[in-house]
Interface confidence: medium
Amino acid sequence: QSYSISQLDIFSQETPLDMAPASFDDQYAGCLADMTAALPDLNHSEFQANKVYADGWAQANNQWQERRAWGSVWGSLPPSPPGFRDEHGVALLAYTANSPLHKEFNAAVREAGRSRAHYLHHFSFKTLHFLLTEALQLLRSHRSRGCQQVYRGVHGLRFRPAGPGATVRLGGFASASLKNVAAQQFGEDTFFGIWTCLGAPIRGYSFFPEEEEVLIPPFETFQVINTSRPTQGPARIYLRALGKRSTYNCEYIKEKKCRSGPCWLGSS
């Protein structure tokens, strides 16, 4: 049993829409191979530390194997882009499953960037963060279209956005839909119209492909174009892609290298 897009991230009651300064936003520029090599050990230790993650991964892995087995018959797996591995598919399925995983993961992502130490010692989703980030990069590079209009409904809160012109980030991995009507149905509290350039379609890797899901990474920046807060119905916020901004880069690999010799701990 799994979730429906565009309502994945449940923020607290009334949240400011800003640059999400505490969000962990690593893009892993220049350390993809090192991170991939570190995954087996890291994943094992995170499974031990995080039951929700271990259970969610196991469920997603079963689903992935099933889809692989039946993919040729039912066409349930899309052609993967170069570099796309099984673990990317499992990570996307784990994120989209209707389990507590996506909720706990995104809550942790929003806080993990409070400090480098917080990420290194208290963030037990390093593997999932890396795999989702890399999967979106691979899927985006494989797509012919550049930017796209998507829609996102949020259940459970109204955002307190800065005025038009402000630069904001969404704070975590954000699920949206290519289908306006799908997002509108779920957007009982806040409805977003988003022009994204870094979001990637994950339709073929979601538990619910019919929702035409697009996943937006936490480091994409947007300009607030317009907002409205009607007394009845959802608040409406319209965002346009600006670019990307990260405070952190390759933090896990830097720390690993520090253990075996001199290192530079600055963030890029």
Epitope: Q1, N98, Q185, F186
Partner: antibody, heavy 122, light 106 residues
Framework: QVTLKESGPVLVKPTETLTLTCTVS??????????VSWIRQPPGKALEWLAH???????SYSTSLKSRLTISKDTSKSQVVLTMTNMDPVDTATYYC??????????????WGQGTLVTVSS | DIQLTQSPSFLSASVGDRVTITCRAS?????MHWYQQKPGTSPKRLIY???KLASGVPSRFSGSGSGTEYTLTISSLQPEDFATYYC?????????FGQGTKLEIK
Amino acid sequence: QVTLKESGPVLVKPTETLTLTCTVSGFSLSNARMGVSWIRQPPGKALEWLAHIFSNDEKSYSTSLKSRLTISKDTSKSQVVLTMTNMDPVDTATYYCARIYGGDSWGYFDNWGQGTLVTVSS
Amino acid sequence: DIQLTQSPSFLSASVGDRVTITCRASSSVSYMHWYQQKPGTSPKRLIYDTSKLASGVPSRFSGSGSGTEYTLTISSLQPEDFATYYCQQWSSNPPTFGQGTKLEIK
């Protein structure tokens, strides 16, 4: 606007089967991250969860009442139906349907119907 | 099944009082949700995911806790707050409710 409305008999006789219908609007029963539960409340007592159903037809029932309950849905009619066999006077209660936001093991009930009082008496 | 035990079952308080209701679970749960029910009406979602206020709920309500002990706090009671409050978990099937706490005017 999300609404749920229960309908069914107000009076049933002991040993009879109760059939309750929940008609929903403002959301679709095909929404994969929402479901519908039936919950009851005997007069002056606490809430008791009975059953739920999700868009993929996944169902779950109260352990103690499992053998007597059946839940089903008709997405095109936006209806969820609960049947409860072998009714007894202790089953007298207000029966609510409620929308589940979330999923198995992490959901909650974010919208409730007004409830329908069912009395079991001969 | 996870049992939820609320304390107290009955509580008399005055307008302006600070009130705390506790919900204890027989096993550890990840989240607790709270509902308010007034006589003759259906329950209304008050707090979800332990500490998040439902839409339209006044900020005098707050929730906290972890593991097996959770609390609902009303910082300054208002006349409209006199009702019955229920906690609910769904960390494991089946979802269960507490027995309720009836909050009455002193």
